[in-house]
Interface confidence: low
């Protein structure tokens, strides 16, 4: 466990021409606040995907009113750090999104209005316990300068906050099987602390906070014996000893959602639906009011004037969740077939189909030849949203309407002369050559090269090509 800390140093116009207008005015004074979203790994997920490592909101900055005619200066910032606590190991590589929000303080109907000024994102490697890292990110004409670090919360230590250290019980040595805690040589590695309540007889852990069951036991705390009489479990590998399905650990086992949140499984993890007044990956953040700006993605916060009363986020189209934190992404199910482009419009799903395909989900391969007539005995050939005609001999063009000139390609070799004929073409060969296309030289001794000339035709006679 530990805390990711973010310190915003400045937010203002970036270098170069085209300085942005100040976000505040005399008519609409405003103040800034920041939101940070952290995800494990070097993911390139959409900004709206869950902040699996956690998220935090800053306090509001001082009220600012633009001075007429003056360029936008660095804007006044909120005090203090943004802190994102993480319960499990620090992943070492992470992705961040930092959003700068503007709160307009004019006479807004229904309270203050929020709008997103800038969003920056990045992917970084960072060891816990290291020094502050400085960064500069640009979003359009704006520039954000900030520092960040990850630190472990005692008793965790190490670059991933997975090693636990305790003060030595004796000045000279650590307990059995436990080593000194470098670099804190006056402390000792502590035994792993498994999930609270994990059965000491039937469970064990390799990471802090987990509870893995020995064979024959199941449940979130390994306290439930595997039944040999019922084989109805929907999950888990088959047990070699009983022939039954042994329930594997499900992501919602033990309900990781705090404060009355309900857990639902996702393909790779879990998702908590939090009651009003709580949010966070596990509904662990509480005491939230509308003043904290808990509604993301332009959601409108209503109610919740004090920590004891709930707030409600009214989400804009395309977002859902108690804090409008989830994007309704129906395109992730890839509903458009045959390479169609999926458009999630919020109210509706539309597919833009590639040429040759149609239907609400591009499921229909259009009959390219429907209503397409090929003239003069040609046959229609479908392909990739277009049609073409395979023309009968002597005809060409897109619809076989053009009478082909069989001599246009100069088919007669070795100086032979070409004559168009109702069934094709005829080559009149130059002396010394024969064949349908005058392709065979006549040998000096009078014998022709294969194939032999048909009986009754002398070399040099016109050869009709059928």
């Amino acid at each position: 466990a530990g805390v990711f800390e973010l310190q915003i140093h400045s937010f203002g116009p970036g270098p170069g021409p085209g300085a942005p207008r100040s976000p505040c005015s005399a008519r609409l004074p405003c103040r800034l606040f920041f939101r940070v979203c952290l995800k494990p790994g070097l993911s390139e997920e959409a900004a709206e995907s869950p902040c699996a490592l956690g998220a935090a909101l800053s306090a509001r900055g001082p009220v600012y009113t633009e001075q007429p005619g003056a360029p936008a200066p660095d804007l006044p910032l909120p005090d203090g750090l943004l802190q994102v606590p993480f319960r499990d190991a620090w992943p070492g590589t992470f992705s961040f999104i930092i959003e700068t929000w503007r709160e307009e303080l004019g006479d807004q109907i229904g309270g203050p209005a929020w709008s997103l000024l800038a969003r920056v994102a990045g992917r970084r490697r960072l060891a816990a316990g290291g020094p502050w890292a400085r960064d500069i990110q640009r979003a359009g004409a704006w520039e954000l300068r900030f520092s960040y670090r990850a630190r472990c919360e005692p008793p965790a230590v190490g670059t991933a906050c997975t090693r636990l250290c305790r003060p030595r019980s004796a000045p000279s040595r650590c307990g059995p099987g436990l080593r000194p805690c470098a670099p804190l040589e006056d402390e000792c590695e502590a035994p792993l602390v498994c999930r609270a309540g994990c059965s000491p007889e039937h469970g064990f852990c390799e990471q802090p906070g987990e509870c893995r069951c020995l064979e024959g036991w199941t449940g979130p705390l390994c306290t439930v014996p595997v039944s040999t009489s019922s084989c109805l479990s929907p999950r888990g590998p088959s047990s070699a000893t009983t022939g039954c399905l042994v329930p594997g650990p499900g992501p919602c086992d033990g309900n990781p959602c705090a404060n009355g949140g309900s857990c639902s499984e996702t393909p790779r993890s879990f998702e908590c639906t939090c009651p009003r007044g709580f949010y966070g990956l596990r509904c662990e953040v509480s005491g939230v009011t509308c003043a904290d700006g808990p509604c993301f993605n332009g959601g409108l916060c209503v109610g919740g004037a004090d920590p004891d009363s709930a707030y409600i986020c009214h989400c804009p189209p395309g977002f859902q969740g108690s804090n409008c934190e989830k994007r309704v992404d129906r395109c992730s199910l890839q509903p458009c077939r045959n390479g169609g482009l999926c458009l999630d419009l919020g109210h509706a799903l539309r597919c833009r189909c590639r040429a040759g395909f149609a239907g609400p989900r591009c499921e229909h391969d259009l009959d390219d030849c429907a209503g397409r007539a090929c003239a003069n005995g040609g046959t229609c050939v479908e392909g990739g949203g277009a049609h073409r005609c395979s023309c009968a001999l002597g005809f060409g063009g897109r619809d076989c309407r053009e009478r082909a000139d069989p001599c246009a390609a100069r088919p007669c070799a070795h100086g032979g002369r070409c004559y168009a004929h109702f069934s094709g073409l005829v080559c009149a060969c130059a002396p010394g050559y024969m064949g349908a296309r005058c392709e065979f030289p006549v040998h000096p001794d009078g014998a022709s090269a294969l194939p032999a000339a048909p009986p009754g035709l002398r070399p040099g006679d016109p050869q009709r090509y059928l």
Partner: antibody
Framework: QVQLQQWGAGLLKPSETLSLTCAVY????????WTWIRQPPGKGLEWIGE???????NYNPSLKSRVSISVDTSKNQFSLKLSSVTAADTAVYYC?????????????WGQGTLVTVSS | IQMTQSPSSLSASVGDRVAITCRAS??????LGWYQQKPGKAPKLLIY???SLQSGVPSRFSGSGSDTDFTLTISSLQPEDFATYYC?????????FGGGTKVEIK
Amino acid sequence: QVQLQQWGAGLLKPSETLSLTCAVYGGSFSGYYWTWIRQPPGKGLEWIGEITHSGSTNYNPSLKSRVSISVDTSKNQFSLKLSSVTAADTAVYYCARGEYGSGSRFDYWGQGTLVTVSS
Amino acid sequence: IQMTQSPSSLSASVGDRVAITCRASQGIRDDLGWYQQKPGKAPKLLIYAASSLQSGVPSRFSGSGSDTDFTLTISSLQPEDFATYYCLQDYDYPLTFGGGTKVEIK
């Protein structure tokens, strides 16, 4: 050449059900949105809804509780039913063909049917 | 999505250059078409996808714009062009038309 021919009752009493049918001649019936659009006298156009040859429908929310569009692929026809009509439903009703994939461009239209609702 | 067309009517002479604008209440990319309607007739498609000329439509008709602001331009008005023109967005359901622009002879 694609042609859309439409027919149906032209005079209704309030609370009755409007029923119109559109037949498609020439061209493919699959691969298009088959659409109904209406135009009150002297006013602009209003999209009512659409259906695909497989029966998928989309309706205008302002009419959704009263409207139903169906399709008969064996006859290359699609139909509109609008229940509980009032004088506000008096309009010229058009059927049209909308293309998939390149915007619902309505490239072929029926001749229009004037439906009058009057007691 | 509301589509606001302007002007609602205009008077022009044969040979004039005429521009009609359509504004969407939110971004609709280029999912917009223009239709011409004459009295007692069904509308006729002129432009689709904001700027693509429908087959068989004279080249004096052109469309431009994207996102929220769109324009239909008739480069040289002909006698047969006097009619009412409508824009249509098909970015989102329900599909919505503009209020129409009536082009009359001056």
